[in-house]
């Protein structure tokens, strides 16, 4: 979390922004809140990024003012505006891509004074993983696949019963590029289970961490997955 | 050549669900945001709703929020439309759009368009 | 919502003159603004984009303009095929959305 002030103290606001993580490929939000005030149009929000010279997104006067908006960000920004008056003034990112990664300034002018926060947005690729039983394999094998990851993960396989177990030797991890060439799918196959058992697929880079669960008993097979983001810091 | 092949269209009583799909090729499918637009019979354009290119994310029209579903196959090249609740002001010719690459928000590819028609 | 509204609704002009249409948006929308034309029974087809940006395998005489709320499309020496019915798009936002269109008729 990152509170910012605004420069004189007597006309300075409180400014909020959250760290956050973006999907390549996929529309990301860019936290930021700030002390609201009563009327719309003396609002402005603009949105910096350190390094590129034009806005990323300005918001003034009830409505988005786009004149000085960065050609890399054509078409992509667009702020909640029915929540600006309630001190909302988050970005919505469409399509996220790799190059958007880097240092953002959420800059807020109100009738109460100025403020503004930085916020570290790193983008990458996630996605949840899916555990199967490989029925095409020699032994009781299990496959985990999720289709979209970057920077390339680490994949740990874990058991209910043999906790602690390294699973390494009897475990094949392989990575394949998309046809983005950036993301990549990850597969990793882990040999010799045994039934009765819960198996965890761990996939972990330094943007996000998913984990696909499976228990196979005679009767059933029961799945479970989740995905949490690592770097959700408030500033 | 790329091409959108729209299908799913028909006639559907009021409160009818139907599901739209729209079977892609000639292009990397899931590099590109998709959308559908339609058109009501001698309307203009309406956009209805969009999905990233992973799937992950979508964005609806005011007009069928939370009754459309919009959804991608990226394994099947197939993009869908899950429609609810229809209604007779949904009846129009519902066409598949490919949304430029670099940048977003305007329709390089159209399919041909499926026809719904909502009516008792 | 940014609502476009495109003028006149019908133009009716001879093969060989020049036609201007015109998209008028409600709030400023820079120069996120493309054109479509649209024959009978067909799909749309892009022209234009970010306004006055060509596509390639659109002839030449198609141009575009303007920025801010006014954006005009120009065909410099009409064609037969060019009768069709002509939509701008707004482009700017999540929501997106089409002019009224402009119907251009043989006189």
């Known amino acids: 979390l990152i509170i910012g002030f605004g420069i004189s103290g007597r006309h300075s606001i409180t400014v909020t922004t959250v760290a956050s993580a973006g999907n390549i490929g996929e529309d990301g939000i860019l936290s930021c809140t700030f002390e609201p005030d009563i009327k719309l149009s003396d609002i402005v929000i603009q949105w910096l990024k350190e390094g590129v010279l034009g806005l990323v997104h300005e918001f003034k006067e009830g409505k988005d003012e786009l004149s000085e908006q960065d050609e890399m960000f054509r078409g992509r920004t667009a702020v909640f505006a029915d929540q600006v008056i309630v001190g909302n003034a988050s970005l919505r990112l469409k399509n996220v891509q790799l190059t958007d990664a880097g240092t953002y300034k959420c800059y807020i002018i109100t009738s109460k004074g100025k403020g503004n926060a930085n916020l570290e947005y790193k983008t990458g690729a996630f996605s949840m993983p899916e555990v199967n039983v490989d029925y095409n394999a020699s032994s009781e094998t299990l496959r985990c696949e999720a289709p979209r990851w970057f920077p390339q993960p680490t994949v740990v396989w874990a058991s209910q019963v043999d906790q602690g177990a390294n699973f390494s030797e009897v475990s094949n991890t392989s990575f394949e590029l998309n046809s983005e060439n950036v993301t990549m799918k990850v597969v990793s196959v882990l040999y010799n289970v045994t039934i009765n058992n819960t198996y965890s697929c761990m996939i972990e880079n330094d943007i996000a961490k998913a984990t696909g669960d499976i228990k196979v008993t005679e009767s059933e097979i029961k799945r479970r997955s989740h995905l949490q983001l690592l770097n959700s810091k408030a500033s | 050549e790329v091409q959108l092949v729209e299908s799913g269209g028909g006639l559907v009583q009021p409160g009818g669900s139907l599901r739209l799909s729209c079977a892609a090729s000639g292009f990397t499918f899931s590099n590109y945001y998709m959308s559908w637009v339609r058109q009501a019979p001698g309307k203009g354009l309406e956009w209805v709703a969009y999905v990233s290119s992973g799937g992950g994310s979508t964005y609806y029209s005011d007009s069928v929020k939370g009754r459309f579903t919009i959804s991608r196959d990226n394994a099947k090249n197939t993009l869908y439309l899950q429609m609810s609740s229809l209604r007779a002001e949904d009846t129009a010719v519902y066409y598949c759009?490919?949304?430029?690459?670099?940048?977003?928000?305007?329709?390089?590819?159209w399919g041909q368009g499926t026809t719904v028609t909502v009516s008792s | 919502e940014i609502v476009l509204t495109q003028s006149p609704a019908t133009l009716s002009l001879s093969p060989g003159e020049r036609a201007t249409l015109s998209c008028r948006a409600s709030q400023s929308i820079s120069d996120y603004l493309h054109w479509y034309q649209q024959k009978p029974g067909q799909a749309p087809r892009l022209l234009i984009y970010f306004a006055s940006q060509s596509i390639s395998g659109i002839p030449a005489r198609f141009s575009g303009s303007g920025s801010g709320t006014d954006f005009t499309l120009t065909i410099s020496s009409l064609e037969p095929e060019d009768f069709a019915v002509y939509y701008c798009?707004?482009?700017?936002?999540?929501?997106?959305?089409f002019g009224q269109g402009t119907k251009l008729e043989i006189k």
């Open positions: 759009a490919r949304e430029s690459y670099s940048q977003g928000n305007y329709f390089d590819y």
């Open positions: 798009q707004n482009g700017h936002s999540f929501s997106l959305t």
